[in-house]
Amino acid sequence: SERCDDWGLDTMRQIQVFEDEPARIKCPLFEHFLKYNYSTAHSSGLTLIWYWTRQDRDLEEPINFRLPENRISKEKDVLWFRPTLLNDTGNYTCMLRNTTYCSKVAFPLEVVQKDSCFNSAMRFPVHKMYIEHGIHKITCPNVDGYFPSSVKPSVTWYKGCTEIVDFHNVLPEGMNLSFFIPLVSNNGNYTCVVTYPENGRLFHLTRTVTVKVVGSPKDALPPQIYSPNDRVVYEKEPGEELVIPCKVYFSFIMDSHNEVWWTIDGKKPDDVTVDITINESVSYSSTEDETRTQILSIKKVTPEDLRRNYVCHARNTKGEAEQAAKVKQKGNGCTEPMTL
């Protein structure tokens, strides 16, 4: 047979679906690997073939499309399960071919069990919403294409295990869930259960979104350096250990890159001959404000080290800050730090 362009196992698409629910899985070839769509390929005489490898097996086998009630079917570039079973877990391959051309890609499909409170090994999308912001809406995700627009499904929303009824600031509105002036107590897993009829059967789709309430953009600030500061003097004798914490507060800013670094006499620690250790720790507030601490330590400080200029720097998307540490030698009358 002719050579086939094998894109291998597309682990970027770790598809997870719930057991005993419908699942529609598009062939990734047309979404990520090829320049044309299924319709173009089909009209050019190319055929889409599906096969799979069961979990913990090496043998590729064709998918059985002759199961009772068409439990597994293919429609254009979509593989349908109505519904899934636990042993459908495995690596699935879609191959596009004719007599002169072949391209294929595999992807893992995991069928996941859930309990009555929707707890499972499923990875949920995270939706960040700003604290005290007016209204935030989340939409029941990944339900497009399961039923025609003429079908009006029933939708029930839950927070954790509790159906959302008479929640003071959370309002279910069909596929949408609205949050009014959200607070940190609104954090949690929100699940929509969509029920729709098809060919005399009722199917359920369960989708969960993790809501995380974060700091508001109106509260966003440049970094604030708590330490070092002008009130604390690091007074040491030669031979002692010098430990200076650089403690910086970063208000939450969506997609901000928060940085903290030290300079010694204007150079990065790696560029000086001093034997310096720097340890970093990070903690977060309930609204994901970040406190980043970088501890600079010199095991046995020399008189020269005590004359150096130690400056803590910080940066986020709102701006930069810097603060020099006041370092002096014990018993030495000079208290003035080197000027920047």
Epitope: E132, H133, H168, F180, L183, S185, K218
Partner: antibody, heavy 118, light 107 residues
Framework: EVQLLESGGGLVQPGGSLRLSCAAS????????MSWVRQAPGKGLEWVSA????????LYADSVKGRFTISRDNSKNTLYLQMNSLRAEDTAVYYC???????????WGQGTLVTVSS | EIVMTQSPATLSVSPGERATLSCRAS??????LAWYQQKPGQAPRLLIY???TRATGIPARFSGSGSGTEFTLTISSLQSEDFAVYYC?????????FGQGTKVEIK
């Protein structure tokens, strides 16, 4: 200095309407959520309504839902409470208060008295 | 909604003595609890937020403690200006709710 000054209170008959205003100064009004809190004569404090800093989100106590409407005009630094279908049990001093999730109601106005009586 | 219960309803204390006021929430409010002081004819004034942080300008004799469902406001040495009604309030969940108040009166 943060200042909140309520106005618009008075005597009104049951079923009547009243509009309260709260003029804010001394802070960036558009950065803060605002609330109305009331206190019936000789009673405790009761939260009535809240509005988000951007004016989009509003919340109400069950006792006033459907009758009261909170709004704000950030260009005028003013908070409003439109009270319709007033009842005798709405008689109270109405306070406007600034709120933050981090600090609760950190500043209050001096209050305006609403009396609902025939 | 979360019900806040304060005790005692009235507390009779002599000036210079310590006063301890309690507040219980019907479910956990984390540390999202505030204390207010109200004198006759005046608006409430924020004393404590975050269960234990003193608001700006509040004297050190006022302190708050607790988390979850049990909270305490302590006035270490009552001054004449401290005789008033004190309210606790949770701001963890909407609707934000107040306790019924504790009146601190001169013994």
């Amino acid at each position: 200095e943060v200042q909140l000054l309520e106005s618009g209170g008075g005597l009104v008959q049951p079923g009547g309407s009243l509009r309260l205003s709260c003029a804010a100064s001394g802070f960036i009004f558009s950065h803060y959520g605002m609330s109305w809190v009331r206190q019936a004569p000789g009673k405790g404090l009761e939260w009535v309504s809240a509005i988000s800093y951007d004016g989009e989100g509003t919340l109400y106590a069950d006792s006033v839902k459907g009758r009261f409407t909170i709004s704000r005009d950030n260009s005028k630094n003013t908070l409003y409470l439109q009270m319709n279908s007033l009842r005798a049990e709405d008689t109270a001093v109405y306070y406007c208060a600034r709120f933050r999730y981090y600090t609760a109601f950190d500043y209050w106005g001096q209050g305006t008295l609403v009396t609902v009586s025939s | 909604e979360i019900v806040m219960t304060q005790s005692p309803a009235t507390l009779s204390v002599s000036p210079g003595e310590r006063a301890t006021l309690s507040c219980r929430a019907s479910q956990s409010v984390s540390s999202n609890l505030a204390w207010y002081q109200q004198k006759p004819g005046q608006a409430p004034r924020l004393l404590i937020y975050g269960a234990s942080t003193r608001a700006t300008g509040i004297p050190a004799r006022f302190s708050g403690s607790g988390s979850g469902t049990e909270f305490t406001l302590t006035i270490s040495s009552l001054q004449s200006e401290d005789f008033a009604v004190y309210y606790c309030q949770q701001y963890n969940n909407w609707p934000w709710t107040f306790g019924q108040g504790t009146k601190v009166e001169i013994k």
